[in-house]
């Protein structure tokens, strides 16, 4: 056998090159047949009507033919015949790859609530061979479950992903990525997750700056509430007691002027949205004001000079806790 061919793999719509090669040429004629055994070329003669076949090279040692705009119907065995005595025959198989026609991602719900499990589907339509679908949430790969449907040598793959969402997933893309021999580079489609979650509440002391609250001082607390949807109601209450009469509420801010010991207690900021409600507590402890000790006095009879030394001593029974955080989130 001195007639050789090579199998050809080509992407639909592109060009396939079929080559019939003769090792030891003796001027025998070469013929190329299609899968129906119809003559494509006999030497340089092409009886077949299909003008997509064009002669690239013809000699006693090679018949090289191009087939443009390849379609899936062109797939199959192509026969090279060498009319030696006895005649020789070899075949080349053309395999046509079809990239997925369409890539669609479908999320069961446009908006999900934290903790909920949602279904995401991705469909790669009409490819050959079947497409491999990979899932990513941001940069993290997830495992989906794929189903393959075959129709007329083409494959439609649907992959299902069950995803439990968390508040951190809000705005994160869910990516459906396909891997297919006819696709170079990344073919992917994505949808951004929209996750609703109950508020997260944080209390910040905006005054005094050093964080130490003393009798006579003022206190300003700011309540920060973040949620989706953004909380519309932010309220301040005093746990187990009435709010002091001299307390001023202004939106998320709580002002208490001229602090005294009766203001000691727990102040709660509450926030809510359609998902749920949350609160954060601030435990106020009002410290004693600074105390002063009278200085010693010296008196002389002739020349009298009075020196008064004022020594300010700060006494604080909780001095060791000056910088401690006194807010509790719930």
């Amino acid at each position: 056998q001195n007639l050789f061919t090579k199998d050809v793999t080509v992407i639909e719509g592109e060009v396939a090159t079929i080559s019939c090669q003769v090792n030891k040429s003796d001027d025998s004629v070469i013929q190329l047949l299609n899968p129906n055994r119809q003559t494509i070329y006999f030497r340089d003669f092409r009886p077949l009507k299909d003008s997509r076949f064009q002669l690239l090279n013809f000699s006693s040692s090679e018949l090289k033919v191009s087939l443009t705009n390849v379609s899936i119907s062109d797939e199959g065995r192509y026969f090279c015949q060498l009319y030696t005595d006895p005649p020789q025959e070899s075949y080349t198989t053309i395999t046509v790859l079809v990239p997925p026609r369409n890539l669609m991602i479908d999320i069961q719900k446009d908006t999900a609530v934290e903790g909920e499990e949602i279904e995401v589907n991705c469909t790669a339509m009409a490819s050959k061979p079947a497409t491999t679908i990979r899932w990513f949430k941001g940069n993290t790969e997830l495992k989906g479950k794929s189903e393959v449907e075959e129709w007329s040598d083409m494959y439609t793959v649907t992959s299902q992903l069950m995803l439990k969402v968390h508040k951190e997933d809000d705005g994160v893309p869910v990516i459906c990525q396909v891997e297919h021999p006819a696709v170079t580079g990344n073919l992917q489609t994505q949808r951004y997750l929209e996750v609703q979650y109950k508020p997260q509440v944080h209390i910040q002391m905006t005054y005094p700056l050093q964080g130490l609250t003393r009798e006579g001082d003022a206190l300003e607390l700011t309540c920060e509430a973040i949620g989706k949807p953004q909380p519309v109601m932010v309220t301040w209450v005093r746990v187990d007691d009435e709010m002091p009469q001299h307390a001023v509420l202004s939106g998320p801010n709580l002002f208490i002027n001229n602090l005294n010991k009766t203001d000691n207690g727990t102040y709660r900021c509450e926030a809510s949205n359609i998902v749920g409600k949350a609160h954060s507590d601030y435990m106020l402890y009002v410290y004693d004001p600074p105390t002063t000790i009278p200085p010693p006095t010296t008196t002389t009879t002739t020349t009298t000079t009075t020196t008064t030394t004022i020594l300010t001593i700060i006494t604080d029974s909780r001095a060791g806790e000056e910088g401690s955080i006194r807010a509790v989130d719930h």
Epitope: S28, V29, Q31, R37, Q38, T39, F42, R43, D44, F45, R46, P47, L48, K49, D50, S51, Q54, L55, F58, Y83, D85, P87
Partner: antibody, heavy 116, light 110 residues
Framework: EVQLVESGGGLVQPGGSLRLSCAAS????????MSWVRQAPGKGPEWVAN????????YYVDSVKGRFTISRDNAKNSLYLQMNSLRAEDTAVYYC?????????WGQGTLVTVSS | QSVLTQPPSASGTPGQRVTISCSGS????????VNWYQQLPGTAPKLLIY???QRPSGVPDRFSGSKSGTSASLAISGLQSEDEADYYC???????????FGTGTKVTVL
Amino acid sequence: EVQLVESGGGLVQPGGSLRLSCAASGFTFSSYWMSWVRQAPGKGPEWVANIKQDGSEKYYVDSVKGRFTISRDNAKNSLYLQMNSLRAEDTAVYYCARGGGRHDYWGQGTLVTVSS
Amino acid sequence: QSVLTQPPSASGTPGQRVTISCSGSSSNIGSNTVNWYQQLPGTAPKLLIYSNNQRPSGVPDRFSGSKSGTSASLAISGLQSEDEADYYCGTWDSSLSAGVFGTGTKVTVL
């Protein structure tokens, strides 16, 4: 040496039939497509029909379709043209030629005259 | 009637170059190879050029062929008296699924 010898021509009345033969030698007959080409007096050649090595593919010029049949017998190294319902315009020298599209060898021809 | 068009005649003195054109369409010359035949008076046609520009063994290199698009041409350089003959182009027509010949050109050596 490649040789193609046609026979079977002659005078025939319109509507009549003739069978032309071509005896091939000097090459492997079963390896080649074969053709019939005709040439009316004072005119250029006109391709008539061709046939694949195993006889599985045949092509004809429109003017003879349904009236002429090309065939071959590889065991006898012979090519045939059965001509029925002959017309005056079929009058020509009929050549047997080797090849389907490229006719690299021709016979000397046989004259077919269709006349009443 | 012929599908391929050639000039009816061409002439030249010995040693001159003569060119014959053959015009067709996308379904014949445009998509298939062209052959040229020489027919001396009283004889069968003989293959002169095949596959657009290839010469069979025994054909002098004075004969050359070319093809461009839907036209082909035959050139005879160094014209000789024995070149006086009828010349025909021929190819396959993919639309007709039939062979086609040119109208023929008579070459005269003056």
